[in-house]
């Protein structure tokens, strides 16, 4: 969280980021609000990169003005229109691409004064992993997949039973470029698995975090997975 | 639950002056714009102004510069409206709104008015 | 200031019609205009906001649209708890009301 004020006195106003990360070839939100206005005439919102000589979007008199806006996001921002009057200067970004990290500068002003907030935006790719049984094997094994990471994760794996061990040894990771040839997906295989016990498949980069989970009794086979973007970074 | 509770209904006499008051809760009172509109017997929606409670900050419209005076007090989460000189045509249904976002989301159940000599 | 103009003070209109209310404001607001029911005795409440909107638990049936200087209200089923004044309302400039439709059930 980063928190902005303009400059002293009357005339100033606070702007609040959030530092946040955006998964290639989809759409980002880069997260910033602002002390309320009455009069959405009042309010100008200008995004700015830092080694970005165009604006990455503007927004005044109750509309977007994108005359400066520099060709790497033309056609690829809009703000929340209806929610600007609310204080919500938050930008969405389409099709993020790698080339789009970098440090933001959300820029207000209304009639109550001006402030501004950086955010840091990072971007890279990231999915939710899933652990099958993988019948084809000779021993029992699991099989932990998933889609598009980038940059490349470390991949660890855990078990209930087991707490603290090392499955390094009895596992193998892999990592196969995607047809884009930026992202990979990811591999890795458990091997020696015993039954009634939880496994996790735990992919790490330094944006995103990811667990697959996989419960295997005789009875039946139970999974969960979820993901965290590790952008919470306070400052 | 977001709902501001405006003061009960005032009787004054032409010239005098009246104070209503509008206590928020169940938001940060500090953040939202609180609005002020009145309302004549039969007639339509005015506003009148807003205050921003966090700095202070008012607005009024042209009509009710000198007329009305928005203040708001932090500690009570409370805001208020002082209607000077009144005259028979103050007379009204006085709303307090909170611009929680886009437009008046939560009104006042009103504070009615009466001017009489 | 800038004027709203509801051109009908009053619309009568039976269960299950449809319905709309304009207003029409003197300058371009692009989308800054909010929609309010009042109920006789009560006090006004949000249903549609910039424009199009509908606010948060607002029945489906209610709807707005429009941009600049002209916008409608819709009520696409009347229901006889609609009878009510509708004031449509611009927050592009210092906040006006426009003056009101009075929907009449038959």
């Known amino acids: 969280l980063i928190i902005g004020f303009g400059i002293s006195g009357r005339h100033s106003i606070t702007v609040t980021t959030v530092a946040s990360a955006g998964n290639i070839g989809e759409d980002g939100i880069l997260s910033c609000t602002f002390e309320p206005d009455i009069k959405l005439s009042d309010i100008v919102i200008q995004w700015l990169k830092e080694g970005v000589l165009g604006l990455v979007h503007e927004f005044k008199e109750g509309k977007d003005e994108l005359s400066e806006q520099d060709e790497m996001f033309r056609g690829r921002t809009a703000v929340f229109a209806d929610q600007v009057i609310v204080g919500n200067a938050s930008l969405r970004l389409k099709n993020v691409q790698l080339t789009d990290a970098g440090t933001y500068k959300c820029y207000i002003i209304t009639s109550k004064g001006k402030g501004n907030a950086n955010l840091e935006y990072k971007t890279g790719a990231f999915s939710m992993p899933e652990v099958n049984v993988d019948y084809n094997a000779s021993s029992e094994t699991l099989r932990c997949e998933a889609p598009r990471w980038f940059p490349q994760p470390t991949v660890v794996w855990a078990s209930q039973v087991d707490q603290g061990a090392n499955f390094s040894e009895v596992s193998n990771t892999s990592f196969e470029l995607n047809s884009e040839n930026v992202t990979m997906k990811v591999v890795s295989v458990l091997y020696n698995v015993t039954i009634n016990n939880t496994y996790s498949c735990m992919i790490e980069n330094d944006i995103a975090k990811a667990t697959g989970d996989i419960k295997v009794t005789e009875s039946e086979i139970k999974r969960r997975s979820h993901l965290q973007l590790l952008n919470s970074k306070a400052s | 639950q977001v709902q501001p509770q405006q003061s009960g209904a005032e009787l004054a006499r032409p010239g005098a002056s009246v104070k209503l008051s509008c206590k928020a809760s169940g938001y940060t009172f500090t953040t939202y714009w609180m609005q002020w509109v009145k309302q004549r017997p039969g007639q339509g929606l005015e506003w009148i102004g807003a205050i921003y409670p966090g700095d202070g900050d008012t607005r009024y419209t042209q009509k009710f510069k000198g007329k009305a005076t928005l203040t708001a007090d932090k500690s009570s989460s409370t805001a208020y409206m002082q209607l000077s000189s009144l005259a028979s045509e103050d007379s009204a249904v006085y709303y307090c709104?909170?611009?929680?976002?886009?437009?008046?989301?939560?009104w006042g159940q009103g504070t009615s008015v009466t001017v009489s000599s | 200031d800038i004027v709203l103009t509801q051109s009908h003070k009053i619309m009568s209109t039976s269960v299950g019609d449809r319905v709309s209310i304009t207003c029409k404001a003197s300058q371009d607001v692009r989308t800054a205009v909010a929609w309010y029911q009042q109920k006789p005795g009560q006090s006004p409440k949000l249903l549609i906001k910039?424009?199009?909107y509908r606010y948060t638990g607002v029945p489906d049936r209610f709807s707005g649209s429009g941009s600049g200087t002209d916008f409608t209200f819709t009520i696409s089923s009347v229901q006889a708890e609609d009878l009510a004044v509708y004031y449509c309302q611009q927050h592009y400039s210092n906040p006006t009301f426009g003056g009101g439709t009075k929907l009449e059930i038959k």
């Open positions: 910039s424009a199009s």
């Open positions: 709104a909170i611009n929680w976002g886009y437009a008046m989301d939560y």
